[in-house]
């Protein structure tokens, strides 16, 4: 059996339903059997566990995804395999084996695999702050959200108005979330905002940042 | 060699039922998906059922779905077609074909000619 | 349902002319296509599976392409025994379709 599946990697939002298609041909024979089995991000392929069985007729969802998963077509026995999986939550990201068996059909091993990735959108990132912030000193601002997909981006904004800083003070990383301020002044001194951004939407923390000069204690 | 030999073809009435066999020799008849194909005079070929194997999944198109009903004798190497609710439409030689490995249509009968008309 | 489109629907030749016959799928079948010849009074014969594949027995003047949506049967060298009705029919998913049909006559 020659299974096709998409070649691109398919996304899904969080929360809505997934249709991983999944298409083959052959003469279905009473011997016809169709399984999907899920890999977890990172792991071989051996290592995968079924979620949905069709064989003799009848359809056996598996495992901790069984209340979700379900067929486009029931039976599975046009030449359509399309698994839907309902309300989609981050630990369903992964890789999604699709394997048909027609005997006598054994002109190709009859699998196909479609990687998964459930679209989240960047939850409220943590601000903090760790270096010297006297007059002189360098600070680094860090930004971070625990939950993502793809990962966020971080952007690093100074709220109100101040003197442009020269060049070079100020470095950001977008992909770290860091942002790393030198050479700081009491101008420096402000808040500080954090954007984590990615194609499902955004979030932001603050961070006040205050300047001493040397002889004073670190207030942040 | 392969033979389909397909019968009980003929005229009925819009709304009248017909049974259609094919009786199957030279070949493993039970390891085989079977399909009925039609062809109305003067035009194309339409496939309209087929049956796989042991006779556990059938397959119509939605022009034939609910109206005709395909099955299977292995023990008799023999296919049929049962056609209720006959149309004008349904008017075509019937042809009982063998399916390959892949759902093409490897060995056909001769046919048999189904007439619906009052 | 994918719908079989065959051109030409008529085409006139000679024996010892090359033949090309045209399908095309509504969407893409990859390779799941299947030629047939018919003559007159008499049951299909199948001519060409999976695009390209001859069965035992087919004369090797015929020939198949094509993948996705595009298809061709070609005659290299049309024989007094060619002159009949062709057609295309795709073997993907259900349900399974045919073009209308070419048919090849005599010039």
């Known amino acids: 059996v020659e299974v096709k599946v998409p070649t691109e990697p398919l996304s899904t939002p969080l929360g809505k339903t997934a249709e991983l298609t999944c298409t083959y041909s052959t003469s279905v024979g009473d011997s016809f059997a169709l399984e999907w089995s899920f890999v977890q991000p990172g792991k071989p392929i051996s290592e995968s566990h079924p979620i949905l069985y069709f064989t003799n007729g009848h359809l056996y969802p598996t495992g901790s995804k069984s209340k979700r998963v379900s067929l486009l077509q029931n039976p599975p026995t046009v030449g359509v395999a399309t698994l839907k999986l309902t309300d989609v939550h981050p630990s369903d990201t992964g890789t999604y084996l699709c394997q048909v068996n027609n005997p006598p059909d054994f002109y190709t091993n009859g699998l196909g695999l479609i990687n998964l990735t459930v679209l989240v959108p960047p939850s409220n990132p943590l601000c903090s702050q760790s270096g010297q912030t006297s007059v002189g000193g360098s600070t680094a601002l860090r930004c971070s959200s625990s939950e993502g997909a793809p990962k966020p981006v971080y952007n690093w904004v100074r709220l109100g108005t101040f003197p442009t800083p020269s060049p070079g003070s100020m470095v950001q990383d977008e992909v770290s979330g860091q942002l790393i301020l030198t050479n700081l002044s009491l101008t420096s001194s402000g808040t500080y905002r954090c954007v984590a951004t990615n194609q499902m939407g955004s979030a932001s923390c603050e961070l006040t940042l205050s300047v001493t000069e040397p002889s004073q204690g670190r207030v942040a | 060699q392969v033979q389909l030999v397909e019968s009980g073809g003929g005229l009925v009435k819009p709304g009248g039922s017909l049974r259609l066999s094919c009786a199957a020799s030279g070949f493993t008849f039970s390891n085989s998906g079977m399909s009925w194909i039609r062809q109305a005079p003067g035009k194309g070929l339409e496939w309209v059922a087929s049956?796989?194997?042991?006779?556990?999944?059938?397959h119509y198109p939605d022009s034939v779905k609910g109206r005709f009903t395909i099955s299977r004798d292995n023990a008799k190497s023999s296919l049929y077609l049962q056609m209720n609710s006959l149309r004008a439409e349904d008017t075509a030689v019937y042809y009982c074909?063998?399916?390959?490995?892949?759902?093409?249509?490897?060995?056909w009968g001769q046919g048999t000619l189904v007439t619906v008309s009052s | 349902d994918i719908q079989m489109t065959q051109s030409p629907s008529t085409l006139s030749a000679s024996v010892g002319d090359r033949v090309t016959i045209t399908c095309r799928a509504s969407e893409n079948i990859y390779s799941y296509l299947a030629w047939y010849q018919q003559k007159p009074g008499k049951a299909p014969k199948l001519l060409i599976y999976n695009a390209e594949t001859l069965p035992e027995g087919v004369p090797s003047r015929f020939s198949g392409s094509g993948s996705g949506t595009e298809f061709t049967l070609t005659i290299s060298s049309l024989q007094p025994d060619d002159f009949a009705t062709y057609y295309c029919?795709?073997?993907?998913?259900?349900?399974?379709?045919f073009g209308q049909g070419t048919k090849v006559e005599i010039k």
């Open positions: 049956i796989s194997d042991g006779g556990l999944y059938t």
């Open positions: 029919q795709h073997h993907y998913v259900i349900p399974w379709t």
């Open positions: 074909a063998r399916q390959g490995v892949r759902p093409f249509f490897d060995y």
